[in-house]
Amino acid sequence: FERTRSLQDPCSNCPAGTFCDNNRNQICSPCPPNSFSSAGGQRTCDICRQCKGVFRTRKECSSTSNAECDCTPGFHCLGAGCSMCEQDCKQGQELTKKGCKDCCFGTFNDQKRGICRPWTNCSLDGKSVLVNGTKERDVVCGPSPADLSPGASSVTPPAPAREPGHSPQ
């Protein structure tokens, strides 16, 4: 089948990095500068991606493969193939329509990207709060007060009146 196809279609013999030039009697011509073809038998070469502005070139375009971009420091990639660059925030913040904003009380973000997430509710698992939550860190849950027999642990469980995850900000 391949042999028959190549007899019928001379373009199938054109390797990656070339295109089948109809203007030159279907001979294989190299891709022009700033273009590429990643597969054989192409009738055109694709324009290379340009990494502009906040996009940095991670891998240069070649005649057989597209350029790859990443983001300049202070930004991070979003989407397939780094199709977007999003500004970093600090830990304890999230990016909103009005910029980087501190996490609301009861939520945290331990990364420079993404959204603030609620603290873990230790009491749902029948546990107590071992370490209070902050804007940057989730609470740490410890064993339930009932599990702590005298002398078994040096950790003092929080006062009963305190809500799970409470932390003075």
């Epitope: 502005g53 930004f75 989407g79 199709s83 977007m84 999003e86 500004q87 990016l95 910029g99 980087c100």
Partner: nanobody, 122 residues
Framework: EVQLLESGGGLVQPGGSLRLSCAAS????????MSWARQTPGKGFEWVSG???????YYTESVKDRFTISRDNSKNTVYLQMNSLKPEDTAVYYC????????????????WGQGTQVTVSS
């Protein structure tokens, strides 16, 4: 071909003002959101301000109440009026299309100008 051409940069004393312009061509400017970014050797790129096609404006915290973004669709131009300039505003300022409409986010299909240098120094 899309072109964005910034102008209006220069040397200014602290507390002074500058007005940057960005002349756009090669696309439907009136229906496009536009943005300004800046790049400093120390801090890298920073999203500064954006304006939707309808005129809604957004600013990064550090320039709020000092910078004003505006647009003139009849002239295909977006402006950045910069008042009460500080030495930390020293940077190369870039105009860019803003297809994501999301604060601090640009996409690979956005177009960028060549930039104009702003230096704030006494």
């Amino acid at each position: 071909e899309v072109q964005l051409l910034e102008s209006g940069g220069g040397l200014v004393q602290p507390g002074g003002s500058l007005r940057l312009s960005c002349a756009a061509s090669g696309f439907t400017f009136s229906s496009s959101a536009m943005s300004w970014a800046r790049q400093t050797p120390g801090k890298g790129f920073e999203w500064v301000s954006g304006i939707y096609s309808g005129g809604s404006t957004y600013y990064t915290e550090s320039v709020k109440d000092r910078f004003t973004i505006s647009r003139d669709n009849s002239k295909n131009t977006v402006y950045l009026q910069m008042n009460s300039l500080k030495p930390e505003d020293t940077a190369v300022y870039y105009c860019a299309t803003w297809g994501t409409l999301r604060f601090g986010v640009w996409a690979e299909y956005d177009h960028w100008g060549q930039g104009t240098q702003v230096t704030v120094s006494s």
